[in-house]
Interface confidence: medium
Amino acid sequence: MMTGTIETTGNISAEKGGSIILQCHLSSTTAQVTQVNWEQQDQLLAICNADLGWHISPSFKDRVAPGPGLGLTLQSLTVNDTGEYFCIYHTYPDGTYTGRIFLEVLESSVAEHGARFQIP
């Protein structure tokens, strides 16, 4: 029986050009986490295998960093990064737990409002 629950950072927003940490946490189970997959829609961003380590997809290597922990750091954000992200925990003996995070990347407030705050 699967007793665990996934806690995530939920719906989050970040500025274009900035970075964000995607975090999930599996609790209320003693199951062994064998692997965590991070996916955006149907694209694989990264895996963290308990024994074989972290592996980042080549197309994201420049902008994705492993950690902290089993989380994932996205850097140099663009508006195209807006969307759903999934952490998929493969565990033994429970099975698979999935968490969802929605990221909205906003235009930089400095770029939008900078002209209003010029010092005379």
Epitope: T34, A50, D51, P93, T96
Partner: nanobody, 120 residues
């Protein structure tokens, strides 16, 4: 110590198929995760596919570049893992390595690699 021996590499024409094998030998070996990785000339080693325990069975994860073309599998009775590679492309040319982790040791072992060349 677990010894891993890969085989099945060779020269194949674009669109062709190959099946790689990775045999593990070692006392009381019980696999937790098994992965295939590759390294093309002048490039970093990259993740190809992994099979790991989840629930009462196993799950597979693939790099986007091989999804739908490659299939990872394992024969636990023979302590052997396989990578079936179909619709091969010149960009699949690389040395392919397998890695396995032992549940009892909690660390991974790597094979020496087998060269796959896709060329007409």
């Amino acid at each position: 110590e677990v010894q891993l021996v890969e085989s099945g590499g060779g020269l194949v024409q674009p669109g062709g198929s190959l099946r790689l094998s990775c045999a593990a030998s070692g006392r009381n070996f019980r696999r937790n995760s098994m992965g295939w990785f590759r390294q093309a000339p002048g490039k970093e080693r990259e993740f190809v596919a992994v099979i790991t325990r989840s629930g009462g069975g196993e799950v597979t994860t693939y790099a986007d570049s091989v999804k739908g073309r490659f299939t990872i599998s394992a024969d636990n009775s023979k302590n052997t893992a396989y990578l079936q590679m179909n619709s091969l492309k010149p960009e699949d040319t690389a040395v392919y390595y397998c890695a396995m982790s032992s549940v009892t040791r909690g660390s991974s072992d790597w094979g020496q690699g087998t060269l796959v060349t896709v060329s007409s």
